[in-house]
Amino acid sequence: LIIGFGISGRHSITVTTVASAGNIGEDGILSCTFEPDIKLSDIVIQWLKEGVIGLVHEFKEGKDELSEQDEMFRGRTAVFADQVIVGNASLRLKNVQLTDAGTYKCYIITSKGKGNANLEYKTGAFSMPEVNVDYNASSETLRCEAPRWFPQPTVVWASQVDQGANFSEVSNTSFELNSENVTMKVVSVLYNVTINNTYSCMIENDIAKATGDIKVTESEIKRRSHLQLLNSKAS
């Protein structure tokens, strides 16, 4: 969480941003909140990006003002106009690109004063893994697949019964480039699986960590997966 204060002659206002990550090819949110004002027409929101000459987005006098918008953001940004009055300056970003990564500044002017806060935005690809029993294999085998990751992640297997065991010798992981030539499909196979055990396939890069669990018993198979973004810090 990053909290910034204004430094002008007028009073400073508190602006709060949260570091976040964008999944390339999908939409992203750059979060920013501020002390609200009672009049929408008195609020100015400017989003800037370090190293970019034009603005990312500007909202003032109750409407978007994009005459100074940088070309890389045209047609791709929007504020939540109906939420500005309650102090939400968050920015929606369409079709996140790798090049959208960087340091952004959320700069706010209201009748109470000015304030700004920076936001670190990481971009990459991350997806939920699915673990299945591979019935085509000669021995009991698990197959963990996740369709989109970037940068290349690490894959680690773990088991509830053999806690702390190193499965690197009995697993094989491959990375297959997807058609857009950036993200990769992750496939990891674990051999010599025993029943009545829960196995976890953990995929991690510097942006996200995802886990796919599978519980194999004689009577049933249970699956669960979850994904967590790393380094979501407020400012």
Epitope: G25, D64, L66, Q69, R74, R76, R92, K94, N95
Partner: antibody, heavy 119, light 107 residues
Framework: QIQLQESGPGLVQPSQSLSITCTVS????????VQWVRQSPGKGLEWLGV???????DYNAAFISRLSISKDNSKSQVFFKMNSLQADDTAIYYC?????????????WGQGTLVTVSS | NIVMTQSPKSMSMSVGERVTLSCKAS??????VSWYQQKPEQSPKLLIY???NRYTGVPDRFTGSGSATDFTLTISSVQAEDLADYHC?????????FGSGTKLEIK
Amino acid sequence: QIQLQESGPGLVQPSQSLSITCTVSGFSLTSYGVQWVRQSPGKGLEWLGVIWSGGSTDYNAAFISRLSISKDNSKSQVFFKMNSLQADDTAIYYCARDISTIVEGFAHWGQGTLVTVSS
Amino acid sequence: NIVMTQSPKSMSMSVGERVTLSCKASEKVGTYVSWYQQKPEQSPKLLIYGASNRYTGVPDRFTGSGSATDFTLTISSVQAEDLADYHCGQSYRYPFTFGSGTKLEIK
């Protein structure tokens, strides 16, 4: 109330150029981009290009060599010019505005101007 | 270019029937698909944007669904005034592209 209105020549000689003006009201050209779309008789819609709030443009690659879009913010007018017209450029030409500053649907359309390319 | 394929090309339905129109994208377009209704001699009108968001003033019998490559426009109970061409379009990537349309006729 958001409105867009095209005005064009109606008839264009083959190999000549086409100029259409789109006059907008109810919104500012410094806030929204304006898209251009055409519809040939009995055919589907074809996106031609867009001029953004800051004046930069994006064109359909199939028309990039003969299309230019410009605007005058103070007059709330967008200018569309296409060169070297042929018979298969006969179509209704529309200007349109997106639903928001993110392109996710053309919410407001002009009435269209029918352009016939014939000698 | 992303190709948007609509089916069927045309259909004839009775008032009150449920209508399902399909639109398939040749590549993933997220949810950046919109649906337009175009009545004879009129400009297209936006019905659905973002794959499933009904535009202001559009009757709730019109519903959009889908993501990635497969999209559907459903009219829950077709009315006589729904006689029109229906177009889908993607605005995920340049050039923005449209399907060739579905003509809906009322019996």
